[in-house]
């Protein structure tokens, strides 16, 4: 899939598909971003699955697991995002991948992303209507660090 | 900043500015756009060392702590793209903060994320020609994470 | 072509767990979501969740979170539904279906195009 | 959770009917609904998405329209293998509902 976009151009304005812009026979999904919402995440924990496995994906063998949870919105670019939950408080114990150690604590790696909402833009009506696409800047939980706990000074 | 695209389109098409699209005061150039870090850049590099600090950003305090890399491409879109380099192979200790410990390994979460390069579109030639966007996926690394070494069946 | 093939029906006491699979073929498996519906005897469709293959991203109803766990090998193109704490309301057909997506980019359209044959669950003392 | 709310619950038809169902949802949807067939002791099977998108391989006769909150699915001719439960189902917001069936029968 090629955007096309004019040297100087302002911003991507009215789509106007050309004959030579043909669609592909199947979408590259815009969606698999990962991002999380704007709202603080609630850190459900899950005792039965608070351990770091020796195998499987990187999130599962984690000393500070996490799980990804679907954020899906029709109207947003990307439509699917994607935000790591922490399945632990606390580091688990690398002797055992079980026991949690009070001395590490998992904690969110938050990063602010860019999205775009379509709305109806200002004046446009009828079924061929175009979309504005807002720019939002969208809170991203990317994974779970185990780090040690911030001291005061 | 608003992106206008038409209800059913393909794909973002060319860029055609129209009279109704007047343009803003300041443009947020899509080339200019810069992604900056999910954690704040420490500029004092204590951080370049294999330790886990009780302070500052959360790559420092990680106990599979990284520093941030620039990756600058002005034909890219984002422009600047941060890449996590683990400081330290294996996990450093939650109790010194600077020993390392063998049963866990520092290993980089990676992502493929869609990035956009700009090309001259095929057949447009003069001082306002327009230019492609072609859709890619970029290995770019978000963090460190301290993990139970894979276990092999 | 397309095919979704289930385990075979399970009789479990109330309390006890069930781990349901579902075997994609004709596909690319990590491309596209897995659905979980359920459907009681003489009953309506009611939704469970769904699961990404690629990065095991879940979305569950609020009524099964904590006791829908699903998961999915990508070695072998299966998914999995497990659900704990069985009672006897949970007696139901259980479908895996394929979300499949649809129209243009960026903004597709999402339907469950190809489903599992269905996996009767009972659950009797 | 968007509640979808179908009727009738059940209707007997002759062959060669038309025959419409609609769907309610408990918000706008924005057009964001699909409708599935199923016949007895078999998985439901897809035919319409996005309210009037016919899926590969479903017969014209089928077709569906609406907006908003308020959808209809339209069977122009009935034909004997149509004797199924219908179900809508919103993809607008997760989690995803079915309206409650309807269940058609010949007459």
């Known amino acids: 899939v090629s955007l096309r976009i004019q040297e100087g151009c302002s911003h991507l304005p009215s789509c106007c598909p050309s004959k030579e812009q043909e669609p592909p026979e199947e979408w590259l999904k815009w969606s698999s971003a990962s991002v999380s919402p704007p709202e603080p995440l609630s850190h459900t924990h899950h005792a039965e699955s608070c351990r770091a496995s020796k195998d499987g994906p990187l999130n599962s063998r984690a000393i500070s697991p996490w799980s990804y949870e679907l954020d899906r919105d029709l109207n947003r670019v990307p439509q699917d995002l994607y935000h790591a939950r922490c399945l632990c408080p606390h580091c688990v114990s690398l002797q055992t991948g079980s026991h949690m150690d009070p001395l590490g604590n998992s904690v969110p790696l938050y990063h602010n992303q860019t999205v775009f909402y379509r709305r109806p833009c200002h004046g446009e009506e009828g079924t061929h209507r175009r979309y504005c696409l807002e720019r939002r800047l969208y809170r991203v939980s990317l994974a779970c660090v185990c780090v040690r706990p911030r001291v005061m000074a | 900043v608003s992106l206008r695209i038409q209800e059913g389109c393909s794909h973002l098409p060319s860029c055609c500015p129209s009279k109704e699209q007047e343009p803003p005061e300041e443009w947020l150039k899509w080339s200019s756009a810069s992604v900056s870090p999910p954690e704040p850049l420490s500029h004092t590099h204590h951080a370049e060392s294999c330790r886990a600090s009780k302070d500052g950003p959360l790559n420092s305090r990680a106990i599979s702590p990284w520093s941030y890399e620039l990756d600058r491409d002005l034909n890219r879109v984002p422009q600047d793209l941060y890449h996590a380099r683990c400081l330290c192979p294996h996990c450093v200790s939650l109790q010194t903060g600077s020993h390392m410990d063998p049963l866990g390994n520092s290993v980089p979460l990676y992502h493929n994320q869609t990035v956009f390069y700009r090309r001259p579109c095929h057949g447009e030639e003069g001082t306002h020609r327009r230019y492609c966007l072609e859709r890619r996926l970029y290995r770019v690394s978000l963090a460190c994470v301290c993990v139970r070494p894979r276990v092999m069946a | 072509q397309v095919q979704l093939v289930q385990s075979g029906a399970e009789v479990k006491k109330p309390g006890a767990s069930v781990k349901v699979s579902c075997k994609a073929s004709g596909y690319s498996f990590t491309g596209y979501t897995m659905n979980w519906v359920r459907q009681a005897p003489g009953q309506g469709l009611e939704w469970m969740g769904l699961i990404n293959p690629d990065n095991g991203g879940t979305s569950y109803k609020q009524k099964f979170q904590g006791r829908v766990t699903m998961t999915v090998d990508k070695s072998i193109s299966t998914a999995y539904m497990e659900l704990s704490r069985l009672r006897s309301d949970d007696t139901a057909v259980y479908y895996c279906?394929?979300?499949?997506?649809?129209?243009?980019?960026?903004?597709?359209?999402?339907?469950?195009?190809?489903w599992g044959q269905g996996t009767l669950v009972t659950v009797s003392s | 959770d968007i509640q979808m709310t179908q009727s009738p619950s059940s209707l007997s038809a002759s062959v060669g009917d038309r025959v419409t169902i609609t769907c309610q949802a408990s918000?706008?949807?924005?057009?964001?609904l699909n409708w599935y067939q199923q016949k007895p002791g078999k998985a439901p099977k897809l035919l319409i998405y996005y309210t009037s998108t016919l899926h590969t391989g479903v017969p014209s006769r089928f077709s569906g329209s609406g907006s908003g909150t308020d959808y209809t699915f339209t069977i122009s001719s009935l034909q004997p293998e149509d004797i199924a439960t219908y179900y809508c189902?919103?993809?607008?917001?997760?989690?995803?509902?079915f309206g409650q069936g309807t269940k058609l029968e010949i007459k």
């Open positions: 279906a394929r979300e499949g997506y649809y129209g243009p980019s960026p903004f597709h359209h999402y339907a469950m195009d190809y």
């Open positions: 189902q919103q993809y607008s917001k997760l989690p995803y509902t």
């Open positions: 918000q706008d949807i924005s057009n964001y």
